[in-house]
């Protein structure tokens, strides 16, 4: 039977819910799937259920709630129905389903190189997702940066931070690194998707040679 797979709010002002629509072998033919929702502002279950306001904007098998249908103050319950019967149901607060869009505009600058010329430190910077509306203050994001050498499989994770830049220390010179960042609403919600990978290539030792070395 169809099941909810995910509900997500990228910025606490809108949200969308997605479901599976697999027809399993041997199951009876289901009618069209409809999503109904209610805001849980009463303890009575007799409250009104309304149909999904937008089945299109969030893609196939989804329902999108724009800002006119989204309020963070009251939890929501949603249900999938087919042929008049409920096939799945869930309730949540918008704060529970916050998953920000990926950070953008990653870049890096060289901070310094070790005296041996073997290691270098870099500063990685990025911007919050455009729709997070940090200025408005509804979103306080914390970020997690991960990095690894290109040929490695395991990512190294840095501690979560609240700023949009962080130093990464002791990278090996003449190795290429991959860096990615993701964010979450501070204290609630889940991490969103990772940013696009930033490639960091540290130049050869000779390119860092100081003038004094020639004297």
């Amino acid at each position: 039977e169809p099941k909810f797979t995910k509900c997500r709010s990228p910025e606490r002002e809108t949200f969308s819910c997605h479901w599976t629509d697999e027809v399993h072998h041997g199951t009876k033919n289901l009618g069209p799937i409809q999503l109904f929702y209610t805001r849980r502002n009463t303890q009575e279950w007799t409250q009104e259920w309304k149909e999904c306001p937008d089945y299109v904007s969030a893609g196939e098998n989804s329902c999108y709630f724009n800002s006119s249908f989204t309020s963070i103050w009251i939890p929501y319950c949603i249900k999938l129905t087919s042929n008049g019967g409920t096939v799945d149901e869930k309730c949540f607060s918008v704060d529970e389903i916050v998953q920000p869009d990926p950070p953008i505009a990653l870049n890096w600058t060289l901070l310094n190189v070790s005296l041996t010329g073997i290691h270098a430190d870099i500063q990685v910077r990025w911007e919050a997702p455009r729709n997070a509306d940090i200025q408005k203050g509804w979103m306080v994001l914390e970020y997690e940066l991960q990095y690894k050498e290109v040929n490695e499989t395991k990512w190294k994770m840095m501690d979560p931070i609240l700023t949009t830049s962080v130093p990464v220390y002791s990278l090996k010179v003449d190795k290429e690194y991959e860096v990615r960042v993701r964010s979450k609403q501070r204290n609630s919600g889940n991490y969103g998707e990772f940013s696009e990978v930033l490639y960091v290539t540290l130049p050869q030792m000779s390119q860092f040679t100081c003038e004094e070395d020639f004297y």
């Epitope: 502002n41 309020s71 009251i74 929501y76 309730c91 607060s93 704060d95 529970e96 609630s188």
Partner: antibody
Framework: EVQLVESGGGLVQPGGSLRLSCAAS????????IHWVRQAPGKGLEWVAY????????YYADSVKGRFTISADTSKNTAYLQMNSLRAEDTAVYYC?????????????????WGQGTLVTVSS | DIQMTQSPSSLSASVGDRVTITCRAS??????VAWYQQKPGKAPKLLIY???SLYSGVPSRFSGSRSGTDFTLTISSLQPEDFATYYC?????????FGQGTKVEIK
């Protein structure tokens, strides 16, 4: 019996700081949300800030953003409003108010209990 | 921000009168409107939530209704203890906003 008791108000100079407390009894702070609302002398009600202890989420009015910080200590069943860089226009009675959360994702669209208020006066 | 335009700002009435106070939201707020009563020097008290639900312990002479973005608080028969200031509040958008208040005075 549900009760909210504010404390920490007083006279402070512009640019100064105060920390208001809101001690809750008769219910668990973790399962409800706390809002701060203020009322300038002779004026109407203005919503200031919100915290949900269960979700760790906060919101602020534009007028206090970056200057005020709301927090909660669930072990003490107390919410706080840290007010920095205070201005004359922050002079008001400050109330904490509860938004009730019930079983199975139910929440009331209102503040059902309010504290008695604490007066904050910002003046040189 | 969602504006809540409350009217009238004040009114004079006698005991036993039917009193109506209205609030208009600047955009849709569903039924997420509450009404409060406040007396001088006291904290507000909840009367109505979710536009029309009477809060526990509130006398039945108080009622609330909704028509689109217009919300009404009605006191069917004004009692001496009802002379106070009344506020509407929208609980839909961020930030939460209040109407400017209606002072109900004795005629």
């Amino acid at each position: 019996e549900v009760q909210l008791v504010e404390s920490g108000g007083g006279l402070v100079q512009p640019g100064g700081s105060l920390r208001l407390s809101c001690a809750a009894s008769g219910f668990n702070l973790y399962s409800s949300s706390i809002h701060w609302v203020r009322q300038a002398p002779g004026k109407g009600l203005e919503w200031v800030a919100y915290i949900s202890s269960s979700y760790g989420s906060t919101y602020y009015a534009d007028s206090v953003k970056g200057r005020f910080t709301i927090s909660a200590d669930t072990s003490k069943n107390t919410a706080y409003l840290q007010m920095n860089s205070l201005r004359a226009e922050d002079t008001a009675v400050y109330y904490c108010a509860r938004q009730y959360y019930g079983y199975h994702y139910y929440a009331q669209e209102a503040f059902d209990y309010w504290g008695q208020g604490t007066l904050v006066t910002v003046s040189s | 921000d969602i504006q809540m335009t409350q009217s009238p700002s004040s009114l004079s009435a006698s005991v036993g009168d039917r009193v109506t106070i209205t609030c208009r939201a600047s955009q849709s707020v569903s039924s997420a409107v509450a009404w409060y009563q406040q007396k001088p020097g006291k904290a507000p008290k909840l009367l109505i939530y979710s536009a029309s639900s009477l809060y526990s312990g509130v006398p039945s002479r108080f009622s609330g209704s909704r028509s689109g973005t217009d919300f009404t608080l009605t006191i069917s028969s004004l009692q001496p203890e009802d002379f106070a200031t009344y506020y509407c509040q929208q609980f839909w958008g961020t930030p939460i906003t209040f109407g400017q208040g209606t002072k109900v005075e004795i005629k």
